[in-house]
């Protein structure tokens, strides 16, 4: 469940957007005679978000340095350029970190953080769920089914609702609730399954309305270099909260001597940084996609935008090969644990497990791996990138493909390595989950590249979607499911079921190639989905009659 | 009708084994947590031993004071509970009772909704 | 492991009268407490589940009530056929146990 909305919603903050502001910017300025006195006055003092076309262009993965010529803009409004364009036009430099806007920018990757901690914390604790509520295999599957279509389905309408109303009280609201929510399931009775299910998709509504508004507050208070690094910051919180969710559920449990504490910890937490959110993060007017102006907004329509987004090949198969992502983080995420477990009962290095919970120390170390593989494979993934983009213009596809089908090998190992090494097994782990998640950054800054700015915030909550519906939505009840089946047709011995289990998650390196496959053909459309995309925006740099999506 | 109906009770010597064995009607065996509770004369109920469905691994639990010594298995296919009693003690000396767990397709519960007629168990030398 | 007590060991009662049957649990245990009747040579059978839920064929006259430590088993005006020993089962961890239980007789 290691998904990407967080780092697709980051991609609103893409260069072609900044350059494509300051553009209208300065020819607004041009048509109203000389100044730019106009330039930034709409946003006021509060301007941080207009950004800058100029100084260094910084992706996830690079950047392109432009000589400065000029002096930065007024100091009162920072990031604001100057009107004149042309070759020697004043370019801004990109606004200082303030302590206030940096303040903002680590609470709500903090609450990034606690998103992603109490999402993991529950599958710290699942065997130990399982256990009270007497849940059977077909309803823990159902207990993180639930959690993800609910979030898959609010995602959308958070992105809807975060373009046009107040975003840091939605957001604070959003945390309010799911802190409330998952306190009050820590004390559900025994007899009620149902709302224990209910509550986590509650959980999933209300930790959508995050996911999906927090990286666009980010994108609003910072210039381009800044804002990339705090962006990176905010994806860095995905790997960080899900490891720490394992970690806090097992060691929760074990101090407490009861599991339901570990469902107590992020509300708490949460608590506090929906407070410091209401408190410290300023009330930011929207970012660039609100300069284009009524008439832009008028002529482009959510089913044209839609359809827009369809034919954009590059798109499509990006989000496709993002499904693939999310449907083997997801399935892998619930069921290694169970399965080294397994797989150290059949070399008898370990008793069967007769009293859950059953790999408790397997989930501790697979949380620490995850932990520190998102963090390389991020830092990995970009590092790729900068290096391939001299020698290709598709390297940002190119690179995530090689991934994918790298980190499908090692997962195919892990399965071979796992009948006679656990160590063995975690390695294959660990150099899988770095590849599989070195693409996170790339992703965002492909969709960046090939998708419009008055076309993101739909292109990123479509992206959340699709890669929910067709990846951890439902990849952790298939493979029970197909675990369940091949054990039916067995004799009951450990030996089965650590093979069926191993049999079922040998889909995941399938899927993983098959994502692979949708990054290359990513590759193939990329240049021209690129150029189309800047050919584009260019068009709405022109006089609005000219103007055409 | 739910029916459970237990066999293989006897007479025993001290370390010897003995197979109690459930059959079965009247509900889907398959889905549905079984257990083992016994009651030696005289006195109250205690909990020996539960297994789940084969879809949650067959999963056994088991009383601290058996643990080691007896094991719960069951065959779908004959909708029978069995509890295989080795290294008997006098004091395992009781009524052993077929229970069956509520089934809530999703989730069972853990106490015990009809119950065997039961069968003696004597371990004395 | 979680203990249960029940009080009192031994309960006398004239037919009609209404009784309180106590149990205490060594934790709090939510409601996560059953009740069970066994008559004389009998097999025990299932009274009231998650301390207050009834059970389809039990007379009304059984209720139950209670969460945390300390639930009651209430039968309103006795009958003779309710003089038998009543058992609670605590479900909220494992091993799952019973208290040693209250037995009704006739005064």
């Known amino acids: 469940m290691m998904c990407l909305e967080c780092a697709s919603a980051a991609a609103g903050g893409a260069e072609e957007e900044e350059a494509d502001a300051e553009r209208r910017r300065r020819r607004r300025g041009a048509q109203r005679g000389a100044g730019g006195s106009g330039c930034c006055g709409a946003r006021g003092a509060g301007g941080a978000g207009v950004s800058a076309a100029g100084d260094e262009v910084q992706t996830l993965s690079g950047s392109v340095r432009r000589a400065p010529t000029g002096p930065p803009g007024t100091p009162g409004t920072p990031g604001c350029a100057a009107t004149a364009k042309g070759p020697g036009a004043q370019q801004p430099k990109p606004a200082s970190l303030g302590r206030g806007r940096g303040a903002a920018a680590a609470i709500l990757s903090l609450g990034n953080v606690l998103n992603y901690l109490d999402r993991y914390t529950v599958a710290g604790v699942l065997l130990d769920i399982q256990q009270h509520f007497g849940v059977k295999a077909r309803g823990a599957g159902l207990l993180q089914s639930v959690f993800i279509c609910s979030f898959m389905v609010a995602a959308p309408i958070f992105g809807y609702l975060g373009d046009r109303f107040n975003r840091k009280v939605i957001l604070s609201c959003g945390i309010f609730f799911w802190s409330a929510v998952t306190f009050s399931s820590s004390f559900i009775p025994q007899q009620y399954f149902w709302l224990l299910v209910l509550s986590r998709g509650l959980v999933g509504i209300g930790e959508a309305s995050y996911s999906t508004i927090a990286p666009t507050i980010i994108g609003d208070l910072f210039t381009k270099n800044t804002r990339t690094l705090m962006l990176s910051v905010f994806y860095f919180a995905i790997p960080l909260g899900s490891g720490l969710g394992y970690i806090t559920g097992s060691s929760v449990k074990q101090a407490a001597g009861d599991w339901h504490w570990a469902l107590r910890v992020s509300p708490v937490l949460g608590m506090i940084t929906g407070t410091l959110i209401l408190i410290l993060v300023p009330a930011t007017k929207r970012g660039h996609a609100d300069q284009l102006g009524d008439q832009l907004k008028a002529r482009t329509s959510w089913l044209r935008d839609m359809k827009a987004l369809i034919r954009n090949r590059s798109y499509v198969f990006s989000s496709l090969a993002t499904s693939a992502v999310s449907f083997a983080t997801g399935a892998l995420g619930m069921w290694i644990p169970l399965y080294l477990h397994r797989a150290q009962v059949v070399q008898k290095t370990a008793e069967t497990c007769n009293s859950p919970p059953c790999g408790a120390k397997d989930s501790l170390i697979f949380g620490a791996i995850t932990c520190f593989t998102g963090f390389l494979g991020v830092v990995t993934g970009a590092g790729a990138t900068r290096w391939c983009r001299l020698k290709t213009q598709r390297a940002d596809p190119l690179v995530c493909a090689v991934g994918m089908l790298g980190s499908a090998i090692f997962i195919c190992l892990i399965f071979v390595a796992a009948k006679s090494s656990i160590v063995g097994a975690y390695i294959c782990i660990f150099v899988g989950e770095t590849l599989l998640f070195s693409n996170w950054a790339i992703t965002a800054d492909i969709l960046m590249y090939v998708v419009i700015p008055t076309r993101r915030a739909t292109a990123v909550a479509l992206q959340s979607f699709t890669s929910h519906l067709l990846g951890d939505a439902g990849s952790p009840y298939l493979i029970g499911f197909i675990s369940d089946l091949i054990r039916q047709s067995t004799k009951d011995s450990p030996l089965w079921e650590f093979l069926s289990l191993g049999y079922a998650l040998m889909l995941c390196p399938f899927v993983v190639v098959l994502g692979g496959m949708f990054f290359l053909a990513t590759a193939l459309f990329f240049v021209s989905d690129r150029a189309r995309a800047e050919q584009q925006v260019n068009q709405l740099a022109m006089p609005p009659a000219s103007v055409k999506v | 009708e739910v029916q459970l109906v237990e066999t293989g009770g006897g007479l025993v010597r001290p370390g010897s084994s003995l197979k109690l064995s459930c059959a079965t009607s009247g509900f889907t065996f398959s889905d549905t947590w079984m257990s083992w509770v016994r009651q030696a004369p005289g006195k109250g109920l205690e909990w020996v031993a539960l297994?789940?469905?084969?879809?949650?691994?067959?999963?056994?639990n088991y009383a601290e004071s058996i643990k080691g010594r007896f094991t719960i298995s069951r065959d779908d296919s004959k909708s029978r509970v069995y509890l295989q009693m080795n290294t008997l003690r006098d004091q395992d000396t009781a009524t052993y009772y077929c229970?069956?767990?509520?089934?809530?397709?999703?989730?069972?519960?853990?106490?015990?909704?009809?119950w065997g007629q039961g069968v003696m168990v004597t371990v004395s030398s | 492991d979680i203990v249960l007590t029940q009080s009192p060991p031994t309960l006398s009662v004239t037919p009609g009268e209404s009784v309180s049957l106590s149990c205490r649990a060594s934790q709090g245990i939510s409601t996560s407490i059953h009740w069970y009747q066994q008559r004389s040579n009998e097999s025990p059978r299932l009274l009231i589940k998650?301390?207050?839920q009834s059970i389809a064929g039990i007379p009304s006259r059984f209720s139950g009530s209670g969460s945390g430590t300390d639930f009651i088993l209430s039968i309103n005006r006795v009958e003779s056929e309710d003089f038998s020993v009543y058992y609670c089962q605590q479900t909220y961890s494992l091993p799952l146990t019973f208290g040693p239980g209250t037995k009704l007789e006739v005064k």
């Open positions: 229970t069956r767990h509520e089934d809530f397709y999703y989730y069972s519960g853990y106490y015990f909704d009809y």
């Open positions: 297994i789940k469905d084969k879809n949650s691994n067959s999963e056994a």
């Open positions: 998650y301390a207050s």
